[in-house]
């Protein structure tokens, strides 16, 4: 029950996280015009990964896409790539995790297969979350660097009479959405990995040893470790006293009525 809950919760948390990563990637407010200690303008600038926008006091908002690919900063391209990789991995992870969910029955899928799929999706979520966090952090670092550079050169102009105020940009809402979403995806991935361990616990089978009544030599057949979910596996240790000391292990696995909810 705890395993199912952990897996289900991991899936939901990851789903929310990936939805957040997608939202952050699409959002226009990755960087917003810094309003602190600046002249108050009737124009508000903000930028995303795909376009830059201007909102005027009149209420008019105008957005222009970055129609060039080669002319964009390498860092911006890197952030785009990280976010897209995060989304793709997350989407595949979600798809895999749906089939891995213990509460969903798909044919006669073994629990060991579900465990593997849960682990795979968990790893995918972790990498997806890390990609998003890395992408957002790279962009944030780029903003901080540019902010201090533009602060140093805030007023440029000839002779100091005519001044051009450089627009400084600070963290936009998308960065916070991205960080939170990346974190959630990461947590969801960890939960899936934990659930995987619960789905496939290591089980030691202690084999039965039978002794001949006459006290003759004992034949011991060691049993190895057998991975099992504990559901639907019927382990029978038959002790046969036929005058010789031997063990016969018969492990049969077949679906029981308790296999799936």
């Amino acid at each position: 029950m705890a395993v199912t809950a952990c897996q289900g919760l991991g899936f939901v948390v990851s789903l929310i996280g990936i939805a957040g990563i997608i939202a952050a990637t699409c959002m226009d407010q990755w960087s917003t015009q810094d309003l602190y200690n600046n002249p108050v303008t009737a124009v508000f600038n903000y930028q995303g990964l795909w376009r830059s926008c201007v909102r005027e006091s009149s209420g008019f908002t105008e957005c222009r896409g970055y129609f060039t690919l080669l002319g964009l900063p390498a860092m911006l391209q890197a952030v785009r790539a990280l976010m897209i990789v995060g989304i793709v991995l997350g989407a595949i992870g979600l798809l895999v995790s749906i089939f891995a969910l213990k509460c969903i029955r798909i044919g006669s899928m073994e629990d060991s297969a579900k465990a593997n799929m849960t682990l795979t999706s968990g790893i995918m979520f972790i990498v997806s979350g890390l990609c998003a966090i890395a992408g957002v952090s790279v962009f944030a670092n780029m903003l901080v660097t540019n902010f201090w550079m533009s602060t140093a050169n805030m007023y440029t102009g000839m002779g100091g009479m005519v001044q051009t105020v450089q627009t400084r940009y600070t963290f936009g809402a998308a960065l916070f959405v991205g960080w939170v979403a990346g974190g959630l995806t990461l947590i969801g991935g960890v939960m899936m990995c934990i659930a995987c361990r619960g789905l496939a616990p290591e089980e030691t089978n202690y084999k039965a040893v039978s002794y001949h009544a006459s006290g003759h030599s004992v034949a011991y057949k060691p049993g190895g470790f057998k991975a099992s979910t504990g559901f639907g596996s019927n382990t029978k240790n038959k002790k046969i006293y036929d005058g010789g000391a031997r063990t016969e292990d018969e492990v049969q696995s077949y679906p029981s009525k308790h296999d799936y909810v």
């Epitope: 108050v40 303008t41 009737a42 005027e56 006091s57 009149s58 209420g59 105020v165």
Partner: antibody, heavy 120, light 112 residues
């Protein structure tokens, strides 16, 4: 047709109060940014205050901050300018204006104005 | 506050003449985000409220005759009337639409 009609002007003593109104018609009032602009007897134009459409943020020229309040009643399609602690330098013709949504913050429509005289 | 300086303060012209008036701002009115200039030109005839002629430094408001042309960028702007008509006799104001407080120039009076 867009119409802006100001009212409420008049003669007032220094330190007195006055409330100007601007009745708007012919456009979706609530979504437009509105401003008050005054013209002094010397014919100089001075922007007084702005209220942002939708958001309701307000901006004022330094000389009227704390004395003038711009507000709007979208149900009545009316813009207001509450003026207190009036001074002689507030004497002017007060225009109600609309900021055009595609005009780069320029004022595309102006009312005929209402006259405010502050004198003892 | 942004200082808007208009020159000349008055212009005597004859009908059909080409007229140019200047407006300078103490800070750039060019927005880096969209590369647009936030400057407007208004025309005010006696006894009337100002009328918008040009916005965004160079875009004519609808209904404005094409003899009116706005140009310039950053801090230096110009309004040109290619062939002055009698009905163009008025005071012309430039306005900063970029920074609060919005500020107007003192005006250029066009007279015969």
């Amino acid at each position: 047709e867009v119409m802006l009609v100001e009212s409420g002007g008049g003669l007032v003593k220094p330190g007195g109060s006055l409330k100007l109104s601007c009745a708007a018609s012919g456009f979706t009032f609530s979504s437009y940014t509105m401003s008050w602009v005054r013209q002094t007897p010397e014919k100089r134009l001075e922007w007084v205050a702005t209220i942002i459409g939708g958001y309701g943020n307000t901006y004022y020229v330094d000389s009227v901050k704390g004395r003038f309040t711009i507000s709007r009643d979208s149900a009545k399609n009316t813009l207001y300018l509450q003026m207190i602690s009036l001074r002689s330098e507030d004497t002017a013709l007060y225009y109600c204006t609309r900021l055009g949504q595609t005009q780069r913050n320029a004022m595309d429509y102006w009312g005929q104005g209402t006259s405010v005289t502050v004198s003892s | 506050d942004i200082l808007m300086t208009q020159s000349p303060s008055s212009l005597s012209v004859s009908a059909g003449e080409k007229v140019t008036m200047s407006c300078k701002s103490s800070q750039s009115l060019l927005n880096s985000g969209n590369q647009k200039n936030y400057l407007a030109w208004y025309q005010q005839k006696p006894g009337q409220p100002p009328k918008l002629l040009i916005y965004g430094a160079s875009t004519r408001e609808s209904g404005v005759p094409d003899r009116f042309t706005g140009s310039g960028s950053g801090t230096d702007f110009t309004l040109t009337i290619s062939s002055v008509q009698a009905e163009d006799l008025a005071v012309y104001y430039c306005q900063n639409d970029y920074y609060y407080p919005f500020t107007f120039g003192a005006g250029t009076k066009l007279e015969l």
